[in-house]
C-alpha cells in the first residue's frame, strides 16, 4: 500500500481569452499542495467558442449568453462538481475590445456587462471580465512560456523538456500575434529601456527581471490586412484592386463601410467614388512584402533604435518563442521546423503565393475559404513584421521557435494571467517543497 497514490488533491482555474476573432476557454489544473512550485500548473482542457470575437456582438448582445454556453457547459463537465465553487473564472479581452472601447466606452461596457452576467450564471467562482492592457498581454505571454519551459526554476535539470530548450536559466523572449495586435516581450542584455512605457520589473522566484514589452495595436494579422487594403485602395484608379497578397484568380468584393469601420484604418480614410471594390489576386510575394512594409513607418525614431512607428526596441537578445497566429499560420504553411532557414521560408512563401487560387482550393479542400485565402498575406506579413518590423536577421531567425504548446499547455497570455491573479508565482523562491502524497519514494 505504500506505493498506492492517495486521491489527488487538485485545484482548477478557468481563463477565457476573448480575442478579436474568437474566444477560447482554457482549464488549468495543479496539485493543491504545490501551488508555489514552478511548472506544476498545466492546461487540462481547451474549448474554442463557436463564432466571432465578443466585440462583434455589439448589435446582438442578447446572443452572448448562448455563444458562451457550449464551452462553459464543457467546463462544468470537465471539473468535478465538488470543485466548482472553488474554481476561479477570469475573462480577459484583448485588442478587439480595446478597439471597440476606442470607438465607444459605452458599447465596450455593454458587451462586457452582458458577458459578466452570462458567466455569473455558472456555479464557478466568477472573478470578472475586463479588457487587459497590451502591456499585460505581452507580460503574461512571457511569463507563460518561461514558466512552462522551467526558466524560473532554480533547479538545473540534466534533461530537456522540449527540443528547443536551452539548458540554462536565460529566459525566452515572447512573440505573440493576434488578429488585432502583436506583442514583443524579452529581457534585453545590459540595455537601458529608454521608454518607461515599455519597461516592466518583475521579481519571480527570488530573481529580478527587467523586461521590455510593447503591444502594437492594429498590427495583428487581420487589422494589418484592413490597413493594407485601406492604404492600397487610396491609389486605385477604379473599383478594382489588383492585390499581390492574394492568389492569382482570387476575387472578393469588399464594402468600403467595412474597411473604415475600424480605428486602424483611420489614417487612410478618404471619400471614395464607390461603395464597394473588388480584390483581384495576382499572387506576388515580393510586391506583397513591399506593400506591407509601407505600414511600418521607420522614418522617425526618437530613441537610439526603434521597431517602427517611433516605438523603442532594444537589440534582440536570446531565443524567442513565437506563438498564437505566428504558430498557426506557419504551421499551416509547414514552416515551423527548427531546420527551416529564413531564406527557405521566403522561398516557400514566394511559391505558395504564386499558386493559382483554384489549385489552392483543391489542395486544401477541408479549409474554410475565408481563412485559406489569407495565408499568403499572413505568411508574408509574419516575415515582414519579424524581419523589417522587429529587425530579426537571417542569422537571428534561427533563435525564433514557433511554438503551439509546451508540455501540453498552449503558449499564450492566459496561463500567466491566471498564475498572477491566483498569486501562484511567488516573488521569492519557496524554501522547500513538500513531496506530494502520490510521489513514489
Amino acid at each position: 500500500t505504500q506505493n498506492k497514490a492517495l486521491p489527488e488533491n487538485v485545484k482548477y482555474g478557468i481563463v477565457l481569452d476573448a480575442g478579436s476573432s474568437h474566444t477560447s476557454l482554457y482549464i488549468y489544473k495543479w496539485p493543491a499542495e504545490k501551488e508555489n512550485d514552478t511548472g506544476v500548473v498545466h492546461q487540462s482542457a481547451e474549448c474554442r467558442v463557436k463564432g466571432p470575437g465578443i466585440s462583434k456582438f455589439v448589435q446582438k448582445v442578447n446572443e452572448i449568453g448562448i455563444y458562451l454556453t457550449d464551452c462553459m457547459e464543457a467546463a462544468r463537465e470537465a471539473i468535478p462538481r465538488s470543485q466548482h465553487q472553488e474554481t476561479p473564472v477570469y475573462l480577459g479581452a484583448t485588442a478587439g475590445m480595446r478597439l471597440l472601447r476606442m470607438e465607444s466606452e459605452e458599447l465596450a461596457d455593454r458587451v462586457l456587462d452582458v458577458v459578466e452576467r452570462s458567466l455569473s450564471n455558472y456555479p464557478f467562482d466568477f472573478q470578472g471580465a475586463r479588457i487587459i492592457t497590451g502591456q499585460e498581454e505581452g507580460a503574461y505571454g512571457w511569463i507563460t512560456i518561461n514558466y512552462l519551459l522551467g526558466k524560473f526554476s532554480q533547479k538545473t535539470r540534466w534533461f530537456s523538456i522540449v527540443p528547443y530548450e536551452t539548458n540554462n536559466q536565460e529566459t525566452f523572449g515572447a512573440l505573440d500575434l493576434g488578429g488585432a495586435s502583436t506583442q514583443v516581450t524579452f529581457v534585453p542584455q545590459n540595455q537601458t529601456i529608454e521608454s518607461p512605457d515599455n519597461a516592466l520589473q518583475f521579481r519571480l522566484y527570488g530573481k529580478d527581471y527587467n523586461v521590455y514589452t510593447h503591444s502594437f495595436l492594429c498590427y495583428g494579422k487581420d487589422q494589418a490586412l484592413w490597413q493594407k487594403l485601406a492604404k492600397d485602395i487610396q491609389v486605385a484608379s477604379n473599383e478594382i484592386l489588383r492585390d499581390p497578397c492574394f492568389h492569382p484568380g482570387y476575387k472578393k468584393v469588399v464594402n468600403v463601410s467595412d474597411l473604415y469601420k475600424t480605428p486602424c484604418t483611420k489614417r487612410f480614410e478618404m471619400t471614395l467614388p464607390f461603395q464597394q471594390f473588388e480584390i483581384q489576386g495576382i499572387g506576388n510575394y515580393q510586391q506583397c512584402h513591399q506593400s506591407i512594409l509601407e505600414l511600418f513607418n521607420t522614418s522617425y525614431c526618437p530613441y537610439s533604435q526603434c521597431a517602427f512607428n517611433g516605438i523603442f526596441l532594444p537589440p534582440l537578445q536570446g531565443d524567442f518563442g513565437a506563438f498564437s497566429a505566428f504558430y498557426f499560420v506557419m504551421k499551416f504553411l509547414n514552416l515551423t521546423s527548427e531546420k527551416v532557414s529564413q531564406e527557405k521560408v521566403t522561398e516557400m512563401m514566394k511559391k505558395f503565393c504564386a499558386q493559382p487560387w483554384e489549385e489552392i482550393k483543391t489542395s486544401y479542400a477541408g479549409v474554410k475559404e475565408k481563412y485559406l485565402s489569407e495565408y499568403c498575406f499572413s505568411g508574408t506579413y509574419i516575415l515582414s513584421l519579424l524581419l523589417q518590423g522587429y529587425h530579426f536577421t537571417a542569422d537571428s531567425w534561427e533563435h525564433i521557435h514557433f511554438i503551439g504548446k509546451i508540455q501540453g499547455s498552449d503558449a499564450g497570455w492566459t496561463l500567466g494571467y491566471m498564475l498572477n491573479l491566483t498569486n501562484m508565482i511567488p516573488a521569492e523562491q519557496p524554501l522547500s517543497t513538500p513531496l506530494s502524497h502520490s510521489t513514489y519514494v
Epitope: L107, T265, E269
Partner: antibody, heavy 116, light 111 residues
Framework: EVQLQQSGPELVKPGASVKMSCKAS????????MHWVKQSHGRTLEWIGY????????TFNQKFKGRATLTVNTSSRTAYMELRSLTSEDSAAYYC?????????WGQGTLVTVSA | DIVLTQSPASLAVSLGQRATISCRAS??????????MYWFQQKPGQPPNLLIY???NQGSGVPARFRGSGSGTDFSLNIHPMEADDTAMYFC?????????FGGGTKLEIK
C-alpha cells in the same frame, strides 16, 4: 491616475496661428482618442474634432475643418491642436478630453485671446 | 447635426429640494441599445466634469444625489437633495454621431 496637462494661455494677433498642447499621463496614450472642445463666453461648448493617437487619423466638425490641425507625438504622449487664421471669434478656452464617446477626463484648458 | 435643447436656461432651487434639468435632442441619440447622452457639471475656472454617462450611469466619484434618466430624444438630470456645492453650470452632450454636440447649458443656483 489619468491626467491631461494643457499648455499656458496665448495672446495672438488676428490672422495669426496658435498651437496648443495636451500632455497625457496615467494610461496607454494610444488606447484612447483625444478630443478638442471650444468654450466661448464661459457658456457655449463646441466640439472641434478628435485624433486617433494610434495612427494620427482625425475627424472634424465641419465648422473647423481646414482651419484646425490635430497632431500627436506618441513618444512624449502629447496631443496638439493648431488653429489658423484667427479672428476675435476664436477667443475662447480650448480643452482636450480623452474618450471614445465618453469624455471622462479633461485638461484644465488653454485660454486663447485674439487681439490686435 | 443633432441639436440639443436644454431647459431651463437658469434655475434657482432651495437647499434640500429637487433640481430637474431637461435636455431634448432633435433626433434619437440611442444606438445599439445605448443612449449616447452625457451630463456635465462645470464650475467657474474649471473644465467640465462628467456626472452621467449613457443617460443614467454615474461617473466615477459622483454623489448618488445626481441621477440621469431618459432615452431616445428626452433626457433629464435630477439633483436631490440640492446642496450648496451644486451651484454650477450643467451641460448635456450627445456622442451618437459626429459632430458631437452640447446643450446650451443651465445655470443652477441656490434660492
Amino acid at each position: 491616475e489619468v491626467q491631461l496637462q494643457q499648455s499656458g494661455p496665448e495672446l495672438v494677433k488676428p490672422g495669426a496661428s496658435v498651437k496648443m498642447s495636451c500632455k497625457a499621463s496615467g494610461y496607454t496614450f494610444t488606447d484612447y482618442n483625444m478630443h478638442w472642445v471650444k468654450q466661448s463666453h464661459g457658456r457655449t461648448l463646441e466640439w472641434i474634432g478628435y485624433i486617433v493617437p494610434l495612427n494620427g487619423g482625425s475627424t472634424f466638425n465641419q465648422k473647423f475643418k481646414g482651419r484646425a490641425t490635430l497632431t500627436v507625438n506618441t513618444s512624449s504622449r502629447t496631443a496638439y491642436m493648431e488653429l489658423r487664421s484667427l479672428t476675435s471669434e476664436d477667443s475662447a478656452a480650448y480643452y482636450c478630453a480623452r474618450g471614445g464617446t465618453r469624455f471622462a477626463y479633461w485638461g484644465q484648458g488653454t485660454l486663447v485671446t485674439v487681439s490686435a | 447635426d443633432i441639436v440639443l435643447t436644454q431647459s431651463p436656461a437658469s434655475l434657482a432651487v432651495s437647499l434640500g429640494q429637487r433640481a430637474t434639468i431637461s435636455c431634448r435632442a432633435s433626433e434619437s441619440v440611442d444606438n445599439f441599445g445605448v443612449s449616447f447622452m452625457y451630463w456635465f457639471q462645470q464650475k467657474p475656472g474649471q473644465p467640465p466634469n462628467l456626472l452621467i454617462y449613457g443617460a443614467s450611469n454615474q461617473g466615477s466619484g459622483v454623489p448618488a444625489r445626481f441621477r440621469g434618466s431618459g432615452s431616445g430624444t428626452d433626457f433629464s438630470l435630477n439633483i436631490h437633495p440640492m446642496e450648496a456645492d451644486d451651484t454650477a453650470m450643467y451641460f448635456c452632450q450627445q456622442t451618437k454621431e459626429v459632430p458631437y454636440t452640447f446643450g446650451g447649458g443651465t445655470k443652477l443656483e441656490i434660492k
